[in-house]
Interface confidence: low
Amino acid sequence: VPRWRQQWSGPGTTKRFPETVLARCVKYTEIHPEMRHVDCQSVWDAFKGAFISKHPCNITEEDYQPLMKLGTQTVPCNKILLWSRIKDLAHQFTQVQRDMFTLEDTLLGYLADDLTWCGEFNTSKINYQSCPDWRKDCSNNPVSVFWKTVSRRFAEAACDVVHVMLNGSRSKIFDKNSTFGSVEVHNLQPEKVQTLEAWVIHGGREDSRDLCQDPTIKELESIISKRNIQFSCKNIYRPDKFLQCVKNPEDSSCTSEI
């Protein structure tokens, strides 16, 4: 008799998830000498332990604490780049500007980037068929709770000037419901963080509007100011040129506004 299985609204666990996590861990620890001490088998066991045999709508931050402990990593607190709805450009930027870090440049963020995972209550099986969708099923699912946990810790670690890259092509440039808007903004520590600097990335080539005046950016400024953190904003009119100038700052065309 086939066992009844809960059907969730979201896609199932990423194919070859255990191998992927282990492979990424090995690659990361071999590239980053400061993380060479990490035992990737233990990391995978802790990752697995956070969600296997647990109801995928009843995951807590506490479930991920053993993994958080194993993945503890010190990044320069004044070199943190947050992002919202513009991950690819943020990652391209930190690949060039190697002294700055997004969450996905840390071990735990790198392990889970673009992956989906969940288990089933009372069985040791990974569910490759479906996993809970944040909106349609439940918010306390393994993936959402993981990103909430690591994002909170990442924001708490930040200091001095924190940068955030925002997508100027979206109807809500700053979205209160994004991970940045709902988690990271509220976990920046005013006693450590002096300024949040937003970089608003323009999509259209002929778009010369000042998107720093957008109502959602003003809303972000208000939230940040109430938390006793200064706010500044820059338009990045030409993201392609922006990246090029990060690569080659001496280029004569890089003195003009980008």
Partner: nanobody, 122 residues
């Protein structure tokens, strides 16, 4: 040119042991993680075990943990897989794979040997 040549497969009874070897050439062996993957008849590839370039860290799939041991001899450019307490479900072609040029997502996207057949049967 990268070459990986597996040997040591054969027919063994349930509960028995085998030791697979993989001779590597064409790249700096000690610089790269190596792994074993297997393919049972009519099935997809399954990752079995891996070892870091230095040999310090080892990793195992849950299905073989406690029974298989991966090791390497960087002076001989050779990878090993000691397989104990073999079961019928371990029957497969076993491939040695290099992590050279990983995309970080899988162990065996880059170079893989021709494989050696392990048959566990009474």
């Amino acid at each position: 040119e990268v070459q990986l040549l597996e040997s040591g497969g054969g027919l063994v009874q349930p509960g028995g042991s085998l030791r697979l070897s993989c001779a590597a050439s064409g790249f700096t062996f000690s610089s790269y993680a190596m792994s074993w993957v297997r393919q049972a008849p009519g099935e997809g590839l399954e990752w079995v075990s891996a070892i870091s370039g230095s040999g310090v860290n080892t990793y195992y799939a849950d299905s073989v943990k406690g029974r298989f041991t991966i090791s390497r001899d960087n002076s001989k450019n050779t990878l090993y897989l000691q397989m104990n307490s073999l079961r019928a479900e371990d029957t497969a072609v076993y491939y040695c794979a290099s992590g050279k040029g990983w995309d970080g997502n899988t162990w065996y996207e880059d170079y893989r040997g021709q494989g050696t057949l392990v048959t566990v049967s009474s």
